[in-house]
Interface confidence: low
């Protein structure tokens, strides 16, 4: 349905509050270094313009596309060249090239200071003094640090952020009420950002066919009672929503997401029995709830897949008639029967099935050729099962911190060229899989673990793409989306790597170490561990453990000393020397 004025259409559909929030998110995700006040000014100007178009859709410039309007507005920023360098060249281009140019300059690792949380009383005062500005600041700060954050979902986070302050700033113990809520929002927000980043990478690097395959598998697991046609309709709509959000079309994305939620709630009977409690909620909460809804129960007495996909003499005929549809149906049927498999495993099985049909349907006796196709699935299924089993055993044996350290060593040996901060961030997050998934029942472990690892490894791929240093990382990241995790798992010690020269400065610590939080101390120690492995990639587990134990003892000793700085100055060089000896 075409509208005379796209901006008026979206303003009316979304309402002023959501419109302003989404425009602020869009601008903050594009111009990540701009000050808050500058963005607020731009958003207010766009909003006033939108209102004139609502009043008269024929008014001047109201017929322009959103990309044109928003791009023109971004290009009015005076300091564009000084702040963003070559991004300013985007403004010389015409749409749609200009928007593509802005998208290409989104920075997944912007050079922004970490967000510092002020005292609770300071935050509550700011909240009460100007609630609207306080919430806009939240949207701005999150969006500029996470340029692919799923915008309509960020509005939901902002609503929860507001609710937390509204409740806790009136509580007797403000901090006890507020801080756990803020911690939860921070952790959920980081997870949500990373999950969305994988969706955008999937669409941008591997195309919408890859995303649709992922969505067919996931939605078939969630909605096993829905018919294939219904799942396909949801997949088509969901692909449109995420394509729009990943492409910076945040107003269209939020509008279409609301339409999808409406459709799902109006058609619950043909989708899932689990949607009921979501559908009674207000819009933002409803959409979030639908996205996170648990898997419905599998229909009783589902027939064996073999009849239609192996035993039937029509397999090649059906495949040739509409390849993607036939493979989509296979994926749907397999996924609805296997909520215990990761989505990535299901996609690997579909890929293996496709490869078999490509080969066998050209053979003299196709049926004979593909008769054993399901047997070929066995090793594909067993590989992630064994991996999860082994790593959960290791996690239970070591605990989270030491499990992270084991992964740090493992991944530094695989790809030592990768920067130390990236290796620390990624390995720490890989290590969180233990606490997240290993406590779950057997049937939920693999989907939890492998699909979480896919999200974390995508972060490695995204950061590595910005500054490529390892051919092995590039290969694992670009060859196949579904085989990324097995590709990284299969990497061995990089024999070609020339060990890094020992730098005593890297292992020099000061008294400020003692005032760090437990998490910050861990990061310092893990940074040192990565540097040790880069210096001695062939160091044994025992050697590394010895050095890390010495390190912990040295830090503990100096943090208990009266003159901490003097202790670090004296004991530090001894620790460095002892470490060199231990690794010789």
């Amino acid at each position: 349905d075409t509208h005379k004025s796209e901006v008026a259409h979206r303003f009316k559909d979304l309402g002023e509050e959501h419109f302003k929030g989404l425009v602020l998110v869009a601008f903050s995700q594009y111009l990540q270094q701009c000050p808050f006040e500058e963005h607020v000014k731009l958003v207010n100007e766009v909003t006033e313009f939108a209102k004139t178009c609502v009043a008269d859709e024929s008014a001047e410039n109201c017929d322009k596309s959103l990309h044109t309007l928003f791009g023109d507005k971004l290009c009015t920023v005076a300091t564009l060249r000084e702040t963003y360098g070559e991004m300013a060249d985007c403004c010389a281009k015409q749409e749609p090239e200009r928007n593509e140019c802005f998208l290409q300059h989104k920075d997944d690792n912007p050079n922004l200071p970490p967000l510092v949380r002020p005292e609770v009383d300071v935050m509550c005062t700011a909240f009460h003094d100007n609630e609207a500005t306080f919430l806009k600041k939240y949207l701005y700060e999150v969006a500029r640090r996470h340029p692919y954050f799923y915008a309509p979902e960020l509005l939901f986070f902002a609503a929860r952020y507001k609710a937390a302050f509204a409740e806790c700033c009136q509580a007797a113990d403000k901090a006890a009420c507020l801080l756990p809520k803020l911690d939860e929002l921070r952790d959920e927000g980081k997870a949500s950002s990373a999950k969305q980043r994988l969706k955008c990478a999937s669409l941008q690097k591997f195309g919408d066919r890859a995303f649709k395959a992922w969505a067919v598998a996931r939605l078939s697991q969630k909605f096993p009672k829905a018919e294939f046609a219904e799942v396909s309709k949801l997949v088509t709509d969901l692909t449109k929503v995420h394509t729009e959000c990943c492409h910076g079309d945040l107003l269209e994305c939020a509008d279409d997401r609301a339409d999808l939620a409406k459709y799902m709630c109006e058609n619950q009977d043909s989708i899932s029995s689990k949607l009921k409690e979501c559908c009674d909620k207000p819009l933002l909460e409803k959409s979030h709830c639908l996205a996170e809804v648990e898997n419905d129960e599998m229909p009783a007495d589902l027939p064996s897949l073999a009849a239609d996909y192996v035993e039937s003499k029509d397999v090649c005929k059906n495949y040739a008639e509409a390849k993607d549809v036939f493979l989509g149906m296979f994926l749907y049927e397999y996924a609805r029967r296997h909520p215990d498999y990761s989505v990535m495993l299901l996609l690997r099985l579909a890929k293996a099935y496709e490869a078999t049909l490509e080969k066998c349907c050209a053979a003299a006796d196709p049926h004979e050729c593909y008769a054993k196709v399901f047997d070929e699935f066995q090793p594909l299924v067993e590989e992630p099962q064994n991996l999860v089993k082994q790593n959960c055993e290791l996690f239970e044996q070591l605990g989270e911190y030491k499990f992270q350290n084991a992964l740090l060593v493992r991944y530094t040996k695989k790809v030592p060229q990768v920067s130390t901060p990236t290796l620390v961030e990624v390995s720490r997050n890989l290590g969180k899989v233990g606490a997240k998934c290993c406590k779950l029942p057997e049937a939920k472990r693999m989907p939890c673990a492998e699909d979480y690892l896919s999200v974390v490894l995508n972060r490695l791929c995204v950061l590595h793409e910005k500054t490529p240093v390892s051919e092995k990382v590039t290969k694992c990241c670009t060859e196949s989306l579904v085989n990324r995790r097995p590709c990284f798992s299969a990497l061995e010690l990089d024999e070609a790597y020339v060990p890094k020269a020992f730098n005593a400065e890297t292992f020099t610590f000061h008294a400020d170490m003692c005032t760090l939080s437990e998490k910050e101390k861990q990061v310092k120690k893990q940074t040192a561990l990565v540097e040790l492995v880069k210096h001695k990639p062939k160091a044994t587990k025992e050697q590394l453990k010895g050095v890390m134990d010495n390190f912990a003892a040295f830090v503990e000793k100096c943090c208990k000393a009266d003159d901490k700085e003097a202790c670090f100055a004296e004991e530090g060089p001894k620790f460095v020397a002892a470490s060199q000896a231990a690794l010789a």
Epitope: A229, E230, S232, K233, T236, Y263, N267, E321, A322, V325
Partner: nanobody, 123 residues
Framework: EVQLVESGGGLVQPGRSLRLSCAAS????????MHWVRQAPGKGLEWVSG????????TYADSVKGRFTISRDNAKNSLYLQMNSLRAEDTALYYC????????????????WGRGTLVTVSS
């Protein structure tokens, strides 16, 4: 280039039958759901019937249920509408329309239209 060419229209008496055909070209026919949509003189468009890519999901407007039958032959890239027990109110220009999807689910998306074939039911 997508082309949809309708045929089979004409003047017919009430109670009689007519079969409309639509020849499709310029795209992979079996990758799309198809529809018949009609427009009576001086009236708006009225959706008549739709059929999914493989023919296993078919839907009809209440006004034609039990009288009209939609079908397709993917080998011949053709869509058909068998119209029985025709009434004066079936008089309209009948369009063959390609959906954007394979399926008939929710609201269809009418992506490509033919030029139409005129059916006149009169005694």
């Amino acid at each position: 280039e997508v082309q949809l060419v309708e045929s089979g229209g004409g003047l017919v008496q009430p109670g009689r039958s007519l079969r409309l055909s639509c020849a499709a070209s310029g795209f992979t026919f079996h990758h799309y759901a198809m529809h018949w949509v009609r427009q009576a003189p001086g009236k708006g468009l009225e959706w008549v019937s739709g059929i999914s890519w493989n023919g296993n999901k078919i839907t009809y407007a209440d006004s034609v249920k039990g009288r009209f039958t939609i079908s397709r032959d993917n080998a011949k890239n053709s869509l058909y509408l068998q119209m029985n027990s025709l009434r004066a109110e079936d008089t309209a220009l009948y369009y063959c329309v390609r959906d954007s999807s394979l399926f008939i689910v929710g609201a269809p998306t009418f992506e490509h239209w033919g030029r139409g074939t005129l059916v006149t039911v009169s005694s």
